[in-house]
Interface confidence: low
């Protein structure tokens, strides 16, 4: 990825266009890879990632992955090409302007993933309000 302070630009050998033929510029995303998180049982969370990167490729979108197991909670923020699977899952919501978390089946952990295509959209991850954790083992308000 390109450092955050670098201006958006397009190399001639990397020009990508959207469906309307307009030039598609690389996107800005939060990119902290995997970090421990205190995001638990909330309707939405900020990533608390201080690194904003320009995605390497114009077609890449922002991705966030939230995982909870018996030991810890992590939040992963990256850029990724939606044509390629991530953690063995297709990025179905890559065109969404918001990062709406969807639960994926992973043995031994609770696993949510979202993708989105507006700048820094993976900074605010949104969980469905209807979702209830299957193991309500602690009161959010105490351990936020």
């Amino acid at each position: 990825t390109i450092p955050p302070h670098v201006q958006k630009s397009v190399n001639n050998d990397m020009i990508v266009t959207d469906n309307n033929g307009a030039v598609k510029f690389p996107q800005l995303c939060k990119f902290c890879d995997v970090r421990f998180s205190t995001c638990d049982n909330q309707k939405s969370c900020m990533s608390n990632c201080s690194i904003t990167s320009i995605c390497e490729k114009p077609q890449e979108v922002c991705v966030a992955v939230w995982r909870k197991n018996d030991e810890n909670i992590t939040l992963e923020t990256v850029c990724h090409d939606p044509k390629l699977p991530y953690h063995d899952f297709i990025l179905e919501d890559a065109a969404s302007p918001k990062c709406i978390m969807k639960e994926k089946k992973k043995p031994g952990e609770t696993f949510f993933m979202c993708s989105c295509s507006s700048d820094e959209c993976n900074d605010n991850i949104i969980f469905s309000e209807e979702y209830n954790t299957s193991n309500p083992d602690l009161l959010l308000v105490i351990f936020q």
Partner: antibody, heavy 121, light 107 residues
Framework: QVQLVESGGGLVQPGGSLRLSCAVS????????MSWVRQAPGKGLEWVSA????????ANTDSVKGRFSISRDNSKNTLYLQMNSLRAEDTAVYFC??????????????WGQGTLVTVSS | DIQMTQSPSSLSASVGDRVTITCRAS??????LNWYQQKPGKAPKLLIY???SLQSGVPSRFSGSGSGTDFTLTISSLQPEDFATYYC?????????FGQGTKVEIK
């Protein structure tokens, strides 16, 4: 049915110590965070301490930090509150309460009947 | 800490009356707001969680509404057993904080 029964309250002098217990039955104690909430005579409710299901995480309100310690014994289905360096302002009925957390759904329910702690010389 | 302010502090009403209690948070708490009922010498009882969800076993005359900073508990038709003190509580951030309570008395 679900029951939370507090004990250990009583009269203690300022600077003294007490240990409260909360015996739990009717639900899978080890799966839930637990809290202590107190109520001074004629006053409102104040959250005091909480502990995670596994007992590895605790939190306290500022006014009791360094003086009160919450713990639990999941094999005995019992919650504890060790209270040291007690002050007159700690005088209250102390309730234990089960914590429930899910997305958008975080509350104390049910509660025990409470035990009265009086700090006075 | 988030401050919770209830109004009124007390009110007098008759059986059958519609009663409304309001709760204001010092900052936005989304829908992380619970309501409890407490009778003298008894433990608090959960009525409403997540601002508007009725706890199992609570009569449907109790309802809650609001989001952000302003919330309301409504008793559509006051019954004799409803005379009690009502508390709101935010569960948005640590520490969880309660309103000062609203005492509903018989007129």
């Amino acid at each position: 049915q679900v029951q939370l029964v507090e004990s250990g309250g009583g009269l203690v002098q300022p600077g003294g110590s007490l240990r409260l217990s909360c015996a739990v039955s009717g639900f899978e104690f080890r799966r839930y965070a637990m809290s202590w909430v107190r109520q001074a005579p004629g006053k409102g409710l104040e959250w005091v301490s909480a502990i995670s299901a596994g007992g590895d995480r605790t939190a306290n309100t500022d006014s009791v930090k360094g003086r009160f310690s919450i713990s639990r014994d999941n094999s005995k289905n019992t919650l504890y509150l060790q209270m040291n360096s007690l002050r007159a302002e700690d005088t209250a009925v102390y309730f234990c309460a089960k914590g429930t957390a899910a997305r958008g759904k975080n509350y104390f329910d049910p509660w025990g009947q409470g035990t009265l702690v009086t700090v006075s010389s | 800490d988030i401050q919770m302010t209830q109004s009124p502090s007390s009110l007098s009403a008759s059986v059958g009356d519609r009663v409304t209690i309001t709760c204001r948070a010092s900052q936005s708490i989304s829908s992380y707001l619970n309501w409890y009922q407490q009778k003298p010498g008894k433990a608090p009882k959960l009525l409403i969680y997540a601002a508007s969800s009725l706890q199992s076993g609570v009569p449907s005359r109790f309802s809650g509404s609001g989001s952000g900073t302003d919330f309301t508990l409504t008793i559509s038709s006051l019954q004799p057993e409803d005379f009690a003190t009502y508390y709101c509580q935010q569960s948005y951030s640590t520490p969880p904080t309660f309103g000062q309570g609203t005492k509903v008395e018989i007129k």
